[in-house]
């Protein structure tokens, strides 16, 4: 247990005095006290010093020292009085809220213990306390109104006799809240129900309250049902249960069921919907587009919503190609139940590889048959570019091949000097090829386009660059003619090809 110095339960000082409170423990220690000004805190290992060199009436209060690391939670306390002849009270809170029959502490702290004999509690405007107000006083804590009643919600003042006259504290507003047990608590089970015509069903409506005076009923589409009631009392609560048993459901049993309970405080109601169907059903849907495009290397979650009754007998994800015969790993498939008849199935495809593009199908089966939902996944690639010099129909031609997805656009640049990449200042000419020739365009593959630039004579101190870009990125290839022939430069940066 921590030790406080000075080792006295109470300390009485005058305003302006210097006060030093030292707490020593086995481990680190903490101070707790009323929020007040002018305190300085020094901590040094296992001791903590709280000090002020200008004590005021607002420093009046109990200062407690605790050792947070102590499993027994030991603490020590000292009460400080700063006896100000003009201020007999230090009020720690101007509003106190309690429930009926709780004790209400009005925290007006006496600043001088000598005044204790002449204290009293009054209502504001000099009004006496209401009759039957049972209260006590502690100079350390203030006035406690015992088992407070709603009618004691008043504005109070603490009064002390000083030199034959009554000196009042600032007012403290007491709010005594009524404890009104509300309407009974309700449960309606199940929250949703689906049955095939001819099957059995059960709906249970139950209500509970601390008071026996309440009613409960079950209604179907606003018609009150005549159901025998079971009553019970446990956990200090009265329970009333209505159970609707249907041996063979038909369409007229479908609809909204409400469980309603009421007492003098009001009523509560909760509802559920009962669906009667002709036969088993299985519906698959997705909030996502069934045609997906994702950049290579990124991830994708494919989600399927399943609505089914009766429950699923089996389900799986299948990869339908075209790249390989690999199947999704079971650990990447996830199922969550939204409620009894609705489920969400997710296939996680992290860091997609080129061979993972293609069709993914979710299959599910229940007594109503089987259904499938298929996603088409196309991967996006930044363009890859290559340039060669050739002769077509006798004309010197630069041939640029660009491959990527979506289909790349092609731009040719001619710039001065020999460079790996044309820079704005060097550009002499720019040609956009709005319609490059598509060499290949198969589903789930990259699109390869070809652009031709006919050059009558290659200028040797110049660079010809083919640039391709799409929504994912860009690629380029610089062609540098040299006297011994032609020289090509792919860009400096390494193009990542998964």
């Amino acid at each position: 247990i921590p030790v406080i110095e000075p080792s006295v339960p109470e300390l009485v000082v005058k305003p302006g005095a210097t006060v030093t409170l030292r707490c020593v423990g086995n481990g680190s220690v903490e101070w707790d006290g009323p929020p007040s000004p002018h305190w300085t805190l020094y901590s040094d290992g296992s001791s903590s010093i709280l000090s002020t060199n200008n004590a005021t009436f607002q420093n009046t209060g109990t200062y407690r020292c605790t050792e947070p690391g102590d499993p027994l939670g030991g603490s020590a306390a000292i009460h400080l009085y700063v006896k100000d002849p003009a201020r007999p009270w230090n009020v720690l809170a101007q509003e106190v809220v309690v429930f009926e029959d709780q004790d209400a502490l009005l925290p007006c702290l006496l600043t001088d213990p000598v005044l204790e004999a002449g204290v009293s509690l009054v209502r504001v405007r000099g009004r006496p306390l209401m009759r039957h107000t049972n209260y006590s006083f502690s100079p350390w804590h203030g006035f406690t109104i015992h088992r407070a009643k709603f009618i004691q919600s008043q504005d109070y003042q603490c009064s002390a006799l000083m030199g034959g006259r009554k000196v009042m504290s600032i007012s403290i507003r007491l709010k005594v809240q009524k404890v009104i047990p509300g309407p009974p608590a309700l449960t309606l089970v199940p929250a949703e129900l689906v049955r095939i015509r001819g099957e059995a069903a059960q709906i249970v409506c139950s209500a509970s309250s601390v008071d026996v005076n309440f009613d409960v009923f079950l209604q179907h589409n606003n018609t009150k049902l005549a159901i025998p009631q079971q009553s019970d009392f446990h956990n200090n609560r009265y329970q009333k249960v209505l159970t609707l048993n249907l041996d063979q459901v038909d369409f007229q049993h479908a609809g909204n069921y409400s469980c309603v309970a009421s007492n003098v405080q009001g009523k509560h109601s909760t509802s559920m919907f009962f669906r009667v169907v002709e036969s088993a059903y299985l519906n698959l849907s997705s909030e996502q587009n069934l045609i997906q495009e994702v950049t290579v290397g990124e991830g994708l979650n494919l989600k399927v919503m399943v609505e089914a009754y009766p429950g699923l007998q089996g389900f799986n994800w299948t990869y339908l190609g075209p790249f390989s015969d690999h199947q999704p790993e079971p650990k990447l498939a996830n199922a969550t139940t939204k409620d009894t008849y609705r489920h969400t199935f997710t296939l996680s495809l992290p860091r997609l590889k080129p061979s993972e593009a293609g069709r993914y199908s979710f299959l599910a089966r229940n007594p109503g048959g089987w259904r499938a939902l298929t996603f088409e996944l196309t991967l996006r690639y930044p363009p890859e570019v290559s340039v060669i010099w050739t002769f077509i129909n006798g004309s010197g031609t630069l041939l640029c091949a660009a491959s990527g997805y979506p289909q790349p656009n092609v731009t040719w640049l001619q710039c001065s000097g020999h460079t790996d990449r044309c820079d704005e200042a060097q550009v002499l000419q720019v040609w956009d090829d709005p319609y490059p020739e598509v060499l290949s365009q198969e589903p789930f593959h990259k699109v390869t386009v070809q652009s031709l630039l006919t050059v009558e004579t290659l200028e040797h101190n110049q660079t010809y660059e083919c640039r391709a870009h799409n929504s994912v990125g860009s690629g380029s290839w610089a062609f540098i003619p040299i006297s011994a022939g032609a020289h090509t430069h792919p860009p400096d940066e390494f193009l990542f090809t998964p």
Partner: antibody, heavy 119, light 107 residues
């Protein structure tokens, strides 16, 4: 000086709604509990509802529970009474009144506003 | 709910008379009772709080007494301006209830 002025009364058909207002001036409205009290023609006083100074607690007479709602806007120094599903027996002069040091002494009253529920 | 029964429902007295009105609660309400005055066509006015305390600014000819279930309101010397209806009001718990009122007239 301390003043409460009610408004919003009038003639209304049964089943309809009406909203009464009470504008306060001359005192710190946000420190006072506020009541609505009504007086049917030729009859005595009937307490209707009370709201605590901060709006945290509201209580109603059984005759209006579930139909009337007391509220306040301390920034506008105004008290309200929203009256729904009005009945002929709600016909009365409606007074707002303030409670200073507790929630029961109605020490300042407005002049009243008349509500007539008739088809 | 606790009922408040005021009597008489009306009375006639002469200027200078001592007038007494009683209010009876159906259960013990301690001293949780107020008295109000309502002049014709006007709003009520608080006269006595906590059964026997005179509200600030109210003439000393008005007084109240009683505790538990029986309460008395007295005008020691009736004045012409005292013509009004007087109501008792209990506030020991909710709902707050008023007596049915006593109409005071001058003979």
């Amino acid at each position: 000086q301390v003043q409460l002025v009610e408004s919003g009364g009038g003639v209304v058909q049964p089943g309809r709604s009406l909203r009464l207002s009470c504008a306060a001036s001359g005192f710190t409205f946000s420190s006072y509990g506020m009541h609505w009290v009504r007086q049917a023609p030729g009859k005595g006083l009937e307490w209707v509802a009370v709201i605590w100074y901060d709006g945290s607690n509201k209580y109603y007479a059984d005759s209006v529970k579930g139909r009337f709602t007391i509220s306040r806007d301390n920034s506008k120094n105004t008290l309200y009474l929203q009256m729904n599903s009005l009945r002929a027996e709600d016909t009365a002069v409606y007074y707002c009144a303030s409670s200073s040091s507790n929630f029961y002494d109605m020490d300042v009253w407005g002049q009243g506003t008349t509500v007539t529920v008739s088809s | 709910d606790i009922q408040m029964t005021q009597s008489p429902s009306s009375l006639s007295a002469s200027v200078g008379d001592r007038v007494t009105i009683t209010c009876q609660a159906s259960q013990d309400i301690s001293n949780y009772l107020n008295w109000y005055q309502q002049k014709p066509g006007k709003a009520p006015k608080l006269l006595i709080y906590d059964a026997s305390n005179l509200e600030t600014g109210v003439p000393s000819r008005f007084s109240g007494s009683g505790s538990g279930t029986d309460f008395t309101f007295t005008i020691s010397s009736l004045q012409p301006e005292d013509i009004a209806t007087y109501y008792c009001q209990r506030y020991d718990d909710l709902p707050i209830t008023f007596g049915q009122g006593t109409r005071l007239e001058i003979k």
